[in-house]
């Protein structure tokens, strides 16, 4: 019962998280104009991953898409990629986890298959959450860097020098949505992985071998639980997720040091 609850809760938490990641990715308020010096502004600027917007105090809002691909900063492209990968992995994870739910019976699917699917979806949710958190964090770091670089700028008018303060941008609502959503997806993934443990009953994971000794009937089960579920010392199953960042030199088509534990 506890396993079913853990799995179900993990699914729901991940579902909310992925919905949040999608929402954050689509939101326009990734960065918003810093209003520290001017709390009431007649023109308010904010930007998303896909377009930038201007809201005028009279109510008119105009948004313009980034119609160039090559002209965009590499960091923005990277953030887009991370968020999309997070959404795709999360969506696949949701699809897999639906079939893995203990409360849903599909044909004669064994618990071991459901356990594997639960683990797979859990890993997918974890990676999805990490992608979202990484994407949002990269964007936030970019904002912080640009914020301090945006010092007073000089515009030259025909009548001489006129000083104007360059528009500075700070964290938008989408960043917080993204962080929370990524965290929820991550938590949901961990819960799925935990549920996987209980979904694989010992009886179905190995064959019991009976040895009959004279005078005594003793059942000896070699290897125990650890030998067959992938949570013990089985080296083939040990690598669940490699969260390590790689440099360009390290990403190779042939096996690297990250491919083995």
């Amino acid at each position: 019962m506890a396993v079913t609850a853990c799995q179900g809760l993990g699914f729901v938490v991940s579902l909310i998280g992925i919905a949040g990641i999608i929402a954050a990715t689509c939101m326009d308020q990734w960065s918003t104009q810093d209003l520290y010096n001017n709390p009431v502004t007649a023109v308010f600027n904010y930007q998303g991953l896909w377009r930038s917007c201007v809201r005028e105090s009279s109510g008119f809002t105009e948004c313009r898409g980034y119609f160039t691909l090559l002209g965009l900063p590499a960091m923005l492209q990277a953030v887009r990629a991370l968020m999309i990968v997070g959404i795709v992995l999360g969506a696949i994870g949701l699809l897999v986890s639906i079939f893995a739910l203990k409360c849903i019976r599909i044909g004669s699917m064994e618990d071991s298959a459901k356990a594997n699917m639960t683990l797979t979806s859990g890993i997918m949710f974890i990676v999805s959450g990490l992608c979202a958190i990484a994407g949002v964090s990269v964007f936030a770091n970019m904002l912080v860097t640009n914020f301090w670089m945006s010092t007073a700028n000089m515009y030259t008018g025909m009548g001489g020098m006129v000083q104007t303060v360059q528009t500075r941008y700070t964290f938008g609502a989408a960043l917080f949505v993204g962080w929370v959503a990524g965290g929820l997806t991550l938590i949901g993934g961990v819960m799925m992985c935990i549920a996987c443990r209980g979904l694989a009953p010992e009886e179905t994971n190995y064959k019991a071998v009976s040895y009959h000794a004279s005078g005594h009937s003793v059942a000896y089960k070699p290897g125990g639980f650890k030998a067959s579920t992938g949570f013990g010392s089985n080296t083939k199953n040990k690598k669940i997720y490699d969260g390590g960042a790689r440099t360009e030199d390290e990403v190779q088509s042939y096996p690297s040091k990250h491919d083995y534990v």
């Epitope: 023109v43 005028e56 109510g59 515009y155 006129v162």
Partner: antibody
Framework: QVQLQESGPGLVKPSETLSLTCTVS?????????WNWIRQPPGKGLEWIGY???????NYNPSLKSRVTISRDTSKNQFSLKLSSVTAADTAVYYC???????????WGQGTLVTVSS | DIVMTQSPDSLAVSLGERATINCKSS????????????LTWYQQKPGQPPKLLIY???TRESGVPDRFSGSGSGTDFTLTISSLQAEDVAVYYC?????????FGQGTKVEIK
């Protein structure tokens, strides 16, 4: 097309409160615009007084902020201006206007002359 | 507050001739977010309320004759009437629409020579 019409007393005594109402027709004051008051002293230029946004938020000219209140009545589709402690310097033609794109004043009322005199 | 200064104060132009009004702001009216200049031009005829002519420095309001054009960026702006007509006799105002409080120029009176 939105039409605006100002109404209120044409004569106000010094130190009293000037009260004007702008009636909106052909549109709703709950629509996504800012509803402004602007004044023009006789033979002089224009001065923005303030606005009430469709959401009810207000924004005033700092030079008049301490004396100005702009409010609205959505049921009557009207918005109002109250200017307290008036002096002869407040004598002007008062316009109500709606602003939208470019923060520009798109529609204007015909204006009403308010004279401050004892 | 942003101070708007118009020049000249008055202008006499022959019918069919070009009229040029200048407006200078004390701060830049260019918004970096959309690369638009928040400057508006109005026409006011005697006994009438002002009428919107140009917004975003160069965008003509619908119904405004194409002889009216706006130009400029940052702090220096120009309203041009390419061929003055009798009905263009009025006072023209520029307005800062970028920063609160919204402020107007002192006005330029256009007359026929």
């Amino acid at each position: 097309q939105v039409q605006l019409q100002e109404s209120g007393p044409g004569l106000v005594k010094p130190s009293e409160t000037l009260s004007l109402t702008c009636t909106v027709s052909g549109g709703s004051i709950s629509s996504n615009y800012a509803w402004n008051w602007i004044r023009q002293p006789p033979g002089k230029g224009l001065e923005w007084i303030g606005y009430i946004y469709y959401s009810g938020n207000t924004n005033y000219n700092p030079s008049l902020k301490s004396r100005v209140t702009i409010s609205r009545d959505t049921s009557k589709n009207q918005f109002s201006l109250k200017l307290s402690s008036v002096t002869a310097a407040d004598t002007a033609v008062y316009y109500c206007a709606t602003s939208y794109y470019g923060n520009s004043f798109i529609y204007w009322g015909q204006g009403t002359l308010v004279t401050v005199s004892s | 507050d942003i101070v708007m200064t118009q020049s000249p104060d008055s202008l006499a132009v022959s019918l069919g001739e070009r009229a040029t009004i200048n407006c200078k702001s004390s701060q830049s009216l260019l918004n970096s977010g959309n690369q638009k200049n928040y400057l508006t031009w109005y026409q006011q005829k005697p006994g009438q309320p002002p009428k919107l002519l140009i917004y975003w420095a160069s965008t003509r309001e619908s119904g405004v004759p194409d002889r009216f054009s706006g130009s400029g960026s940052g702090t220096d702006f120009t309203l041009t009437i390419s061929s003055l007509q009798a009905e263009d006799v009025a006072v023209y105002y520029c307005q800062n629409a970028y920063s609160f409080p919204w402020t107007f120029g002192q006005g330029t009176k256009v007359e026929i020579k």
